[in-house]
């Protein structure tokens, strides 16, 4: 996965900090106040979508080969820049009974991006 | 994740068989001759992109929160119908020494789809 730099237009990971207060979740999430969630942005033209390291999975490589070798549109729409690696984050929050609970929420932080 | 049934155009899993001959991989993949790779197809309108079940993760829900409020840089970020669950498949192939080896290849088969 590639990190976005300057005028990069190809699929890359953009660093982004989300503030829970900003999205109105501070009333139930106690800690942390926010986190570097990051997101994926950029183009996935066919010639790069199947490249190792850029393809989201083996499955993606297979589909992109088919797209290149067959009439367009036989295997779904365009390729999309999406998370390929994520990691969890621990949250301290109020449950329905107003107890404070700590839980590891999966897939919170985007670590890498690729073409679907 | 939804199965595509021809009636809905919302993000769903479409059954699809890939023949390794069709993509020119029959020279190194010995078995099987192909497999049900499947793929994701359909729309991810903003009102469903963040709903759990159709959503990729907590992360998608956060992004959608920003997107629906028109926050830059998320306003132009389109939600994509992508695999949310993939599973491996065993393959027999020739290694560099022309030996036949069996391996579980990760992320070969799309099991479920969701909106990124």
């Amino acid at each position: 996965g590639i990190d976005c730099q300057g005028g990069s237009r190809m699929c890359c990971r953009q660093e982004f900090f989300v503030d829970f207060r900003e999205i109105g979740w501070h009333d139930w999430i106690i800690q942390p106040e926010g986190y570097a969630m990051n997101f994926c942005i950029g183009q996935c033209p066919l010639h790069i979508a199947g490249m190792p390291g850029i393809a989201a999975s083996f499955h993606t490589a297979v589909l992109n080969l088919l797209k290149a070798n067959t009439a367009a549109g036989t295997t779904g729409g365009g390729s999309c820049c999406v998370p390929t690696a994520r990691r969890p984050l621990s949250l301290l929050y109020y449950d329905r009974d107003s107890n404070i609970v700590k839980t590891d929420i999966p897939d919170m932080v985007v670590e890498a991006c690729g073409c679907s | 994740g939804l199965e595509c049934d021809g009636k809905v155009n919302i993000c769903c899993k479409k059954q699809f068989f890939v023949s390794f001959k069709d993509i020119g991989w029959n020279d190194w993949i010995i078995a099987p001759s192909g497999y049900h790779a499947n793929y994701c197809e359909g729309e991810c309108p903003s009102h469903i992109a963040g709903t759990s079940g159709s959503s990729l993760s907590f992360h998608s829900t956060v992004i959608n929160h920003y997107r629906m409020r028109g926050h830059s840089p998320f306003a132009n970020l389109k939600s994509c119908c992508v695999p949310t669950k993939l599973r491996p498949m065993s393959m027999l192939y020739y290694d560099d020494g022309q030996n036949i080896i069996k391996k579980d290849i990760q992320n070969m088969i799309v099991e479920e789809c969701g909106c990124s």
Epitope: - | N26, P32, K102
Partner: antibody, heavy 117, light 107 residues
């Protein structure tokens, strides 16, 4: 349903040749690998050869390499095992079996090859 | 070539017994091991693949376990039709090799 039927076995003298056939039904041989596995009287199973789905890739056990040739006729949905320079130790019941990624998920009933002078 | 060694070579048991057969590979084969059942005068029957996945049509009293080099086939409660010879086989690399077999007899 999937069915494999072997034929062509018999009694043959050492050094002579024999061609075994395996007729498949319920599936197409061009989509699967087909193996030959043999079993000497009162002994265990021994893998002999395979022709993979694309028809170009073939593999043999060291014990038969250079003497046995595996081939396929897609129009007849049949796989063949051409056995030359037969030896007493080739005496066995020969099974053809359908490949499931290196496993054998369907077997024929076998054809007996006896090499004897 | 990968050598497969089964133990015991033969085994006597009664209907209702729980029986375990072991198979050892001469090198790591991950979980790429299968089990077959063969009755006299019949072709082998595919029972278990990938060490623990049961082939459709095989009775649920058969189960497999193990990975790497050591594997087991377990029959939870022997039925009269289970008396046969059992073979393990590795599908990790060519040549595909079988164990020498375990003959399961009535006590």
């Amino acid at each position: 349903q999937v069915q494999l039927v072997e034929s062509g076995g018999g009694v043959v003298q050492p050094g002579r040749s024999l061609r075994l056939s395996c007729v498949a039904s319920g599936f197409t041989v061009s989509s699967y690998g087909i193996h030959w596995v043999r079993q000497a009287p009162g002994k265990g199973l021994e893998w002999v050869s395979v022709i993979w789905y694309d028809g170009r890739n073939k593999d043999y056990a060291d014990s038969v390499k250079g003497r046995f040739t595996i081939s396929r006729d897609n129009s007849k949905n049949t796989v063949y095992l051409e056995m030359k320079g037969l030896r007493a130790e080739d005496t066995a019941l020969y099974y053809c079996a359908r490949d499931k990624t290196g496993d054998f998920d369907s077997w024929g009933q076998g054809t007996l090859v006896t090499v004897s002078s | 070539d990968i050598q497969m060694t089964q133990s015991p070579s033969s085994l006597s048991a009664s209907v209702g017994d729980r029986v375990t057969i072991t198979c050892r590979a001469s090198q790591n084969i991950n979980s790429f091991l299968s089990w077959y059942q063969q009755k006299p005068g019949k072709a082998p029957k595919f029972l278990i693949y990938d060490a623990s996945s049961i082939q459709s049509g095989a009775p649920s009293r058969f189960s497999g376990s193990g990975s790497g080099t050591d594997f087991t086939l377990t029959i939870s409660s022997l039925q009269p039709e289970d008396f046969a010879t059992y073979y393990c086989q590795q599908s990790y690399s060519s040549p595909f090799t079988f164990g020498q077999g375990t003959k399961l007899e009535i006590k």
